[in-house]
């Protein structure tokens, strides 16, 4: 058993049929010695009496808010949550496996630049009685500070018969140098509590590996005289690290017909302009990627040809 | 340790092209190592991230762009020097700061070159003949060092009398390649910045 926060405790349980469970000692936070009784949750059923109570915890019915009273007055509370371990593996019932980039990916994180700011998100089908708390650090043995905000519900989607909820959190490394060469990864830890079930999820990464620039901005077309060709121009996204001559991007320019089946023409360039043939009803899209370290491409920025 | 004396090439900036070749070569070599050594811990998640140049050179700090010198977090490790003005272009008056930056890059390359050559000598003794260093990568390191045009004492290649542990050597190769790729990215950024200056 360990304390998650004040008066909230997590009991780690080996989860198998007829498991004996764990013995947990609860102590009433009071100077009183006599006449103390204990109840669980809203039940008026008295569990026992005395300043300390030893309880056998073996299933969710044994978790909950234990309250000690004296003469009708509440003295203190202890909330017990369960963390299940089945066949040596901690349960992952609360979050959905996103399976990208690999199986057992519950947390996904992205950074728009090298400032040390990043966003992580996760998915669940649970809509109520759900809380998250996020901690992060650079390295684990001698951790350096990373500050995370509160997790918030960022999107709701319908998937077949199910509703899916996306939560996200923003974190910022306390002292980040955009030019630094990372040798210790960022660690992100998410505590998830659904009713009386506790689970924790972790992710470890280097900022350089989760970079995904915003799409290029101010995408414009300039027709070239007496030609089907156009000059496409764009700019670095505002959120990208500066100076741009140091943090350079490379770009992919794509001409895509109306039909998905039509052949796509693609050009790769380090410049912020390119000359392409603009077909009728086609659209021109541009995306960006770090020029020197191949992490993710940005989403496309698009303009119609006409 | 005496700093090498900078005598940058006049004419067009040759370093950018060589640094791009270097990044390509080390990335290809790393990919090859990851594929060939698939049953060894050779991915970024599996290896320990070591920097053989740590406390010996200060490339990141010495080559910091002027715009980042206002960032306290970039200045916390040493008395940092910055690229201020001038470039590796036609200017014969290379600033002292830039000379420091380029000499630091040169020292990095020299250290990695020695490590890779020593390692290759060991890998050539492996009866499995599983992996060797790409000669192209070694050549590209050499070309960039020549383009930087520093005069520096040659470091003797490390020789070892004991029987090499090939498993450890291959893991060390992965660690070195990962670290060198990261340094090659920094070098490329620096050269791109200098080219634009």
């Amino acid at each position: 058993i360990w304390e998650l926060k004040k008066d909230v405790y997590v009991v780690e349980l080996d989860w198998y049929p007829d498991a004996p469970g764990e013995m947990v000692v609860l102590t009433c936070d009071t100077p009183e010695e006599d006449g103390i009784t204990w109840t669980l949750d809203q039940s008026s059923e008295v569990l026992g009496s005395g300043k300390t109570l030893t309880i056998q915890v073996k299933e969710f019915g044994d978790a909950g808010q234990y309250t000690c009273h004296k003469g009708g007055e509440v003295l203190s509370h202890s909330l017990l949550l369960l963390h299940k371990k089945e066949d040596g593996i901690w349960s992952t019932d609360i979050l959905k496996d996103q399976k990208e980039p690999k199986n057992k990916t519950f947390l996904r994180c992205e950074a728009k630049n090298y400032s040390g700011r990043f966003t992580c998100w996760w998915l669940t089908t649970i809509s109520t009685d759900l809380t998250f708390s996020v901690k992060s650090s650079r390295g684990s043995s001698d951790p350096q500070g990373v500050t995370c905000g509160a997790a918030t519900l960022s999107a709701e989607r319908v998937r077949g018969d199910n509703k899916e909820y996306e939560y996200s959190v923003e974190c910022q490394e306390d002292s980040a140098c955009p030019a630094a060469e990372e040798s210790l990864p960022i660690e992100v830890m998410v505590d998830a509590v659904h009713k009386l079930k506790y689970e924790n999820y972790t992710s470890s990464f280097f900022i350089r590996d989760i970079i995904k620039p915003d799409p290029p901005k101010n995408l414009q077309l300039k027709p070239l005289k007496n030609s089907r060709q156009v000059e496409v121009s764009w700019e670095y996204p505002d959120t990208w690290s500066t100076p741009h001559s140091y943090f350079s991007l490379t770009f992919c320019v794509q001409v895509q017909g109306k039909s998905k089946r039509e052949k796509k023409d693609r050009v790769f360039t380090d410049k912020t302009s390119a000359t392409v043939i603009c077909r009728k009803n086609a659209s021109i899209s541009v995306r960006a990627q770090d020029r020197y370290y191949s992490s993710s491409w940005s989403e496309w920025a698009s303009v119609p040809c006409s | 340790r005496n700093l090498p004396v900078a005598t940058p090439d006049p004419g067009m900036f040759p370093c950018l092209h060589h640094s791009q070749n270097l990044l390509r070569a080390v990335s290809n070599m790393l990919q090859k190592a990851r594929q060939t050594l698939e049953f060894y811990p050779c991915t970024s998640e599996e290896i320990d991230h070591e920097d053989i140049t740590k406390d010996k050179t200060s490339t990141v700090e010495a080559c910091l762009p002027l715009e980042l010198t206002k960032n306290e977090s970039c200045l916390n490790s040493r008395e940092t020097s910055f690229i201020t003005n001038g470039s590796c272009l036609a200017s014969r008056k290379t600033s002292f700061m830039m000379a420091l930056c380029l000499s630091s890059i040169y020292e990095d390359l020299k250290m990695y070159q020695v490590e890779f050559k020593t390692m290759n000598a060991k890998l050539l003794m492996d009866p499995k003949r599983q992996i060797f260093l790409d000669q192209n990568m070694l050549a590209v390191i050499d070309e960039l060092m020549q383009a930087l045009n520093f005069n520096s004492e040659t470091v003797p290649q490390k020789s070892s009398l004991e029987e090499p542990d090939f498993y450890k050597t291959k893991i060390k190769l992965c660690i070195l390649l990962h670290a060198f790729r990261i340094r090659a990215v920094t070098i490329d950024r620096v050269m791109s910045y200098l080219n634009a200056s």
């Epitope: 469970g21 008295v46 009496s49 309880i55 056998q56 073996k58 299933e59 019915g61 044994d62 | -």
Partner: nanobody, 114 residues
Framework: EVQLVESGGGLVQPGGSLRLSCAAS????????MYWIRQAPGKGLEWVST???????IYGNSVAGRFTISRDNAKNMLYLQMNMLRPEDTALYYC????????RGQGTQVTVSS
């Protein structure tokens, strides 16, 4: 009519063991929290242990680690395994359907003495 009948008491030396049993009838045994309470000579009732319908036990400070409560819902039976007995465990032990012992059996005497 609710009936609770205790058995298994006796005289035992310090450090010894006893197993108390309680046969319940006249109510849906499996739905109830069940309790063992005791009364030492010249003293009031003292709660010893509780068992929830799911079989999870709860223990007072004086017996935790030495006593184990259990139940067999199919047989309507409640048990108390008492190990490492001490002289201060000497008391009349009751099986009860509430912590105050308002619905309890006749009790079974446990004496711990050398």
């Amino acid at each position: 009519e609710v009936q609770l009948v205790e058995s298994g008491g006796g005289l035992v030396q310090p450090g010894g063991s006893l197993r108390l049993s309680c046969a319940a009838s006249g109510f849906t045994f499996s739905s109830y929290y069940m309790y063992w309470i005791r009364q030492a000579p010249g003293k009031g009732l003292e709660w010893v242990s509780t068992i929830k319908p799911n079989g999870s036990g709860i223990y007072g400070n004086s017996v935790a680690g030495r006593f184990t409560i259990s139940r067999d819902n199919a047989k309507n039976m409640l048990y108390l395994q008492m190990n490492m007995l001490r002289p201060e465990d000497t008391a009349l032990y009751y099986c009860a359907r509430d912590v105050r012992g308002t619905v309890r059996g006749q009790g079974t005497q446990v004496t711990v003495s050398s």
